[in-house]
């Protein structure tokens, strides 16, 4: 889970081992800081829970893609 208590950078030390339904998701952010042990994606759920996920997993990439597509404002 995210840990930012003693550091200015939020890092992930463990990844969720279950796929999260996209229905649960509100947003995500990528963790790429060299101060963190591994690259990660932190999903924020619609009830404001933060969940660390492995960006190498296909479901994580698909979920980010889904959020990206629906977040874009349609051009008029």
């Amino acid at each position: 889970q995210p840990d930012a208590i003693n550091a200015p950078v939020t890092c992930c030390y463990n990844f969720t081992n279950r796929k999260i339904s996209v229905q649960r998701l509100a947003s995500y952010r990528r963790i790429t800081s060299s101060k963190c042990p591994k690259e990660a994606v932190i999903f924020k759920t619609i009830v404001a829970k933060e969940i660390c996920a492995d960006p190498k997993q296909k479901w994580v990439q698909d979920s980010m893609d889904h959020l990206d597509k629906q977040t874009q404002t349609p051009k008029t």
Epitope: V22, Q23, R24, L25, A26, S27, I46, H66, L67, Q70
Partner: antibody, heavy 119, light 112 residues
Framework: QVQLLESGAELVRPGSSVKISCKAS????????MHWVKQRPGQGLEWIGW????????EYAPKFQGQATLTADTSSSTAYMQLSGLTSEDSAVYYC???????????????WGQGTTVT | DIVMTQSPLSLPVTLGQPASISCKSS???????????LNWLQQRPGQSPRRLIY???KLDSGVPDRFSGSGSGTDFTLKISRVEAEDVGVYYC?????????FGQGTKLEIK
């Protein structure tokens, strides 16, 4: 299509408990959180809390902590809310609802039960 | 808790005319992720609530495009471009940015 079917009206005594059910159909209940909302007669809406049916995680509004207990049974696609220590202030319609900002090709969705009246 | 204040509380409107409802929050609803979790609900007489708008301005499926939402920070507006008879009911704003989720006190729309 998605439906949330709540149990029937309840007439209860002060100090007693009541357990309301919300049966989901048309989607996998484990895929999303189930929320509960209170509406007193002629009044507005109050959020009670949510349950994650997949693992039983819950979160309650401070006002309802200790009075409301949310549970779910994925095998029967049913969510439950138990209210204890009932008083006249708890006479209300209680709604279950599930919603998302994303999740379909169109975008978000929101579904509500028909409400259970507790008197 | 975040207080959501709606105005007016009662809104008599002539059929075919526009209507506007204001919702002000006691704190900004802009979340740390850059999104604003402000929604609008409609509750017709004797019915369950129904979400009309989410994330300030996105219309739910099946909601007529005469409804629109706008705003940012602490000030939000629901507009109906031309009121129809089926629009009668109570409208609530609802925030999901801060715990616990809270609702406005409701605006009752009626036909003049």
């Amino acid at each position: 299509q998605v439906q949330l079917l709540e149990s029937g009206a309840e007439l209860v005594r002060p100090g007693s408990s009541v357990k309301i059910s919300c049966k989901a159909s048309g989607y996998a209940i484990k895929d999303n959180y189930m929320h509960w909302v209170k509406q007193r007669p002629g009044q507005g809406l109050e959020w009670i809390g949510w349950i994650d049916p997949e693992n039983g995680d819950t979160e309650y509004a401070p006002k309802f902590q200790g009075q409301a207990t949310l549970t779910a049974d994925t095998s029967s696609s049913t969510a439950y809310m138990q209210l204890s220590g009932l008083t006249s202030e708890d006479s209300a319609v209680y709604y279950c609802n599930t919603w998302a900002y994303y999740g379909t090709s169109y975008g978000g969705f929101a579904y509500w039960g028909q409400g259970t009246t507790v008197t | 808790d975040i207080v959501m204040t709606q105005s007016p509380l009662s809104l008599p409107v002539t059929l075919g005319q526009p209507a506007s409802i204001s919702c002000k929050s006691s704190q900004s609803l802009l979340d740390s992720d850059g999104k604003t979790y402000l929604n609008w609900l409609q509750q017709r007489p004797g019915q369950s609530p129904r979400r009309l708008i989410y994330l300030v301005s996105k219309l739910d499926s099946g909601v007529p495009d005469r409804f629109s939402g706008s705003g940012s920070g602490t000030d939000f507006t629901l507009k109906i471009s031309r009121v129809e008879a089926e629009d009668v009911g109570v409208y609530y704003c609802w925030q999901g940015t801060h715990f616990p989720q809270t609702f406005g006190q409701g605006t009752k729309l009626e036909i003049k």
